[in-house]
């Protein structure tokens, strides 16, 4: 109860906040190691994983490795950390740190990257007391681009087997759509004949619960009625309308995993690993 705990909780709080007073920066006595953070520029499509590597030139005895994003005001926002052989996930579990077997390299991954994850990232090593110090890596830039769903005709001529698959897919989709349209027509007729039966219930989709794809699940394709002309173009989903008793129902057709066709990316969660840096930054840390 009355035991004195000293100033360490305060110091630790300062370190965890991600801003550092000048007197913490350069203590001459404490061992430290240069850090790299690569690739210098990484581009992934939304939904893919983005992975950086934070590397230490040498393994100091006691250190904390933090992963930061630079805010628009040049403040460092801590995303996740590694401390004394354990990972400390941040508030957002999409940001993951993994220590590699050599002990000096750390994979820092954003799972299912979003457009607003684009920005500047870095890692920082904090060398623990006595003489606490900070050591920052170079910055790296992440660009998350919108998913591009090209028309099959624009892709380089695929092998015959793939075009056969695509033809089968189109025929299958068409037949399913026709069936569903007939079903909808039947539903509409029934609704017209028995209007009271359709008024009571209303199913509202949650904006926070999109179609999830588990790590082992087959990729899931969704197709909405705006795509009936089979032009595989990107659609920006409209926000869900407020739930009303007389709400018109729209169906979403869900196809269980099929092989990826040239005009469509198969899975949003394919690991986008170490991209080579841009040519201007030379070979850097990335083997061919």
């Amino acid at each position: 109860m009355g035991s004195r705990r000293g100033p360490w909780p305060l110091v630790w709080a300062v370190l965890q906040l991600g801003w550092w007073p000048g007197w913490l920066l350069d203590s001459p006595d404490r061992p430290w190691s240069p850090l790299t953070f690569s690739p210098a520029q990484l581009t992934v499509q939304e939904g893919e994983n983005a992975t950086f590597t934070c590397s230490l030139a040498d393994i100091p005895d006691s250190f904390v490795l933090n992963w930061y994003r630079l805010s628009p005001r040049n403040q460092t926002d801590k995303l996740a950390a590694f401390q004394e052989d354990r990972i400390e996930p941040g508030r957002d579990r999409r940001f993951r740190v993994t220590r590699l077997p050599n002990g000096r390299d750390f994979h820092m991954s954003i799972v299912a990257a979003r457009l607003n994850d684009s920005g500047i990232y870095l890692c920082g090593a904090i060398y623990l007391p006595p003489n606490t110090q900070i050591n920052e890596s170079p910055r790296a830039e992440l660009s998350v681009t919108e998913r591009t769903l090209e028309p099959p005709t624009q892709s380089p001529s695929p092998p015959p087997r793939l075009s056969g698959q695509l033809q089968g897919l189109v025929i299958g989709v068409t037949s399913v759509l026709v069936g569903v349209l007939l079903l909808l027509l039947l539903t509409w007729v029934l609704a017209a004949v028995f209007p009271r039966a359709t008024r009571g219930a209303c199913v509202c989709g949650s904006e926070d619960e999109p179609l999830k794809e588990g790590p082992d699940a087959a990729p899931v394709f969704t197709l909405d009625y705006g795509e009936l002309d089979f032009q595989w173009r990107e659609k920006t989903p409209e926000p869900p309308a407020p739930c009303a008793p007389e709400q018109t129902e729209y169906a979403t057709i869900v196809f269980p995993g099929r092989p990826a066709s040239p005009g469509r990316r198969a899975s949003a969660s394919s690991l986008q690993g170490a991209q080579p840096p841009s040519p201007e930054d030379g070979p850097g840390l990335w083997p061919p």
């Epitope: 920066l25 350069d26 061992p31 430290w32 190691s33 240069p34 790299t36 210098a40 590397s55 230490l56 030139a57 040498d58 393994i59 100091p60 050599n102 002990g103 000096r104 390299d105 050591n135 920052e136 890596s137 170079p138 910055r139 201007e280 930054d281 030379g282 070979p283 850097g284 840390l285």
Partner: antibody, heavy 115, light 108 residues
Framework: EVQLVESGGDLVKPGGSLRLSCLAS????????MNWVRQAPGKGLQWVAF????????AYADGVKGRFTISRDDAKNTLYLQMDSLRADDTAVYYC????????WGQGTLVTVSS | SYVLSQPPSATVTLRQTARLTCGGD??????VEWYQQKPGQPPVLIIF???SRPSGIPERFSGANSGNTATLTISGALAEDEADYYC???????????FGEGTQLTVL
């Protein structure tokens, strides 16, 4: 194309001073740690000084501590090495190089310390 | 201060395998870089992070690092591989980059 070009090498008397410069181009200079490395005639490579990204941290080889100062000007894409109290054994070709990893090096500039 | 030990010279027959060593106390905990230097030229990075090759470096060059020894292997050495080879690490306790003394490789 990535290029590092050293300049400032010269013949200087013992006890004199010299300032070496290294102009970087073809890459984002501010995003890389930098080294000065030297090589005496017919000898091996010897690391001289290191500066990290942002210029906050510097490190020096034992033989040059207190005499040499490394610095960088990211606005000018230039790395510097200020050499004071020069000695005969500082005679060498001085290279600037990106550090960790040392994937690009300049062609070097010759510093000769002799009376 | 931290010391890296390299044999002063090594010889390999054309198209045979050369193994160059770099010894240091617990070097396995450190990230090793290897450089090739030919007369009158600056050094060229051939291995970084123990075993990674920068783009443009032939596949015959490979690296490994564990315990107290780092190794550079040249599989099927060519005449153009005749050069001096240096290993380098960062020593966090002395806060210094350290080079080995270098190994002069001769290809017969």
């Amino acid at each position: 194309e990535v290029q590092l070009v050293e300049s400032g090498g010269d013949l200087v008397k013992p006890g004199g001073s010299l300032r070496l410069s290294c102009l970087a181009s073809g890459f984002t200079f501010s995003n890389f740690h930098m080294n000065w490395v030297r090589q005496a005639p017919g000898k091996g490579l010897q690391w001289v000084a290191f500066v990290n990204v942002g210029g906050i941290r510097t490190a020096y080889a034992d033989g040059v501590k207190g005499r040499f100062t490394i610095s960088r000007d990211d606005a000018k894409n230039t790395l510097y090495l200020q050499m004071d109290s020069l000695r005969a054994d500082d005679t060498a070709v001085y290279y600037c190089a990106r550090a960790f990893p040392g994937d690009y090096w300049g062609q070097g500039t010759l510093v000769t310390v002799s009376s | 201060s931290y010391v890296l030990s390299q044999p002063p010279s090594a010889t390999v027959t054309l198209r045979q395998t050369a193994r160059l060593t770099c010894g240091g106390d617990s070097i396995g905990r450190k990230s090793v870089e290897w450089y090739q230097q030919k007369p009158g030229q600056p050094p060229v990075l051939i291995i970084f992070g123990d075993s990674s090759r920068p783009s443009g470096i032939p596949e015959r060059f490979s690296g490994a690092n564990s315990g107290n020894t780092a190794t550079l292997t040249i599989s099927g050495a060519l005449a153009e591989d005749e050069a001096d080879y240096y290993c380098q690490v960062w020593d966090s306790s002395t806060k210094a980059w350290v080079f080995g003394e270098g190994t002069q490789l001769t290809v017969l």
